[in-house]
Interface confidence: low
């Protein structure tokens, strides 16, 4: 079943999923200048077995110039930046996703991948959040948000997660600022597709904040 | 998928003591918050106990708290529920049930969150 909506926007956050869930699809999207090839996979599926879980179907992205030119595409400033595929070395993750049943690691890169990742996520899928450089994490639980099945519908919990700046002033207990509502936006802002984003490795995250390949802003 | 059995019941004077064991199958156990209920004659099926995943964490409901504790075997896909000084009002059907949520944190006591279920044993608390 797959969930209706996003994950939960926390202001000043970002979430990555450590393992997919069988059924969850990646679509197949090409950076500017490039397309998938004719007769190319829509989409990656996230299958298993008794065994082991993989994904299924391959992305393959061609130039989209003409034929008969030998013009490179120039790639956008922010399609230059390295993909980092990576998992994020942090606390957050719970396990070694490798070793978790039932669930397909994040598929490796394909070349001239768009920048974004979007994928449409299934329900008991968790993704995680930190926050991004320069503001810290506030905890008042889990920094996780989980897609649930409950009486017929899918919701996204609301993680329990405040980013602060560095340099904002500490505000006296019973003083803290409105958080999002905890079924997350209106109905009318749902949207099947849920993009998740490059993690960085935090002492990496500094360098991409100017170029932002977050397709939501965090503001 | 995860499949449940829980074996174990039957019947006990009150004071007494039973142990019941719950028997997962299915690949992704270990991922999986474990919970106990009930269902007494009559009554709605109720929350009795829960485990978290990583087996770091049990909640119970406040009538069996002192008296019942919740564990788990990862290595044996096995769940258990200790008895002692049982009381006749914990007469009832337990169910052994898996959250729906691969490594939740949330640890619910609220039986729709819980997406497998065994067939239940019986338990009778009399003299």
């Known amino acids: 079943e797959l969930c209706d909506d996003d994950p939960p926007e926390i202001p000043h956050a970002t979430f990555k999923a450590m393992a997919y869930k069988e059924g969850t699809m990646l679509n197949c999207e090409c950076k500017r200048g490039f397309r998938r090839i004719k007769s190319g996979s829509l989409y990656m599926l996230c299958t298993g077995n008794s065994s082991h879980s993989s994904w299924d179907n391959q992305c393959q992205c061609t130039s989209s110039a003409t034929r008969n030119t030998t013009k490179q595409v120039t790639p956008q400033p922010e399609e230059q930046k390295e993909r980092k595929t990576t998992e994020m070395q942090s606390p957050m993750q719970p396990v070694d996703q490798a070793s978790l049943p039932g669930h397909c690691r994040e598929p490796p890169p394909w070349e001239n991948e768009a920048t974004e990742r979007i994928y449409h996520f299934v329900v008991g899928q968790m993704v995680y959040y930190q926050c991004v450089q320069g503001y810290r994490a506030l905890h008042r639980g889990p920094a996780e948000s989980v897609c649930k099945m409950t009486h017929g519908k899918t919701r996204w919990t609301q993680p329990q997660l405040i980013c602060t700046g560095e340099m904002e002033t500490s505000q006296f207990p019973g003083e803290e600022k409105p958080q999002a509502s905890p079924e997350g936006r209106p109905e009318s802002e749902t949207s099947c597709l849920v993009t998740t984003t490059d993690f960085q490795i935090q002492t990496e995250m500094a360098a991409t904040m100017e170029t932002s390949i977050f397709t939501t802003e965090y503001q | 998928q995860v499949q449940l059995v829980e074996s174990g019941g039957g019947l006990v004077q009150p004071g007494g003591s039973l142990r019941l064991s719950c028997a997962a199958s299915?690949?992704?156990?270990?991922?999986?918050?474990m919970g106990w209920f009930r269902r007494a004659p009559g009554k709605e099926r109720e929350f009795v106990a829960v485990?978290?995943?990583?087996?770091?964490?049990?909640e119970y409901t406040d009538s069996v708290k002192g008296r019942f504790t919740i564990s788990r075997d990862n290595d044996k896909n096995m769940v258990y529920l200790q008895m002692n000084s049982l009381k006749p009002e914990d007469t009832g059907v337990y169910y052994c049930?898996?959250?729906?949520?691969?490594?939740?944190?949330?640890?619910?006591?609220?039986?729709?969150?819980?997406?497998?279920w065994g067939q239940g044993t019986q338990v009778t608390v009399s003299s």
């Open positions: 485990i978290s995943w990583n087996v770091d964490s049990t």
């Open positions: 299915g690949r992704t156990f270990e991922t999986h918050n």
């Open positions: 049930a898996a959250d729906n949520i691969p490594l939740s944190s949330d640890m619910s006591p609220t039986a729709a969150e819980y997406g497998y």
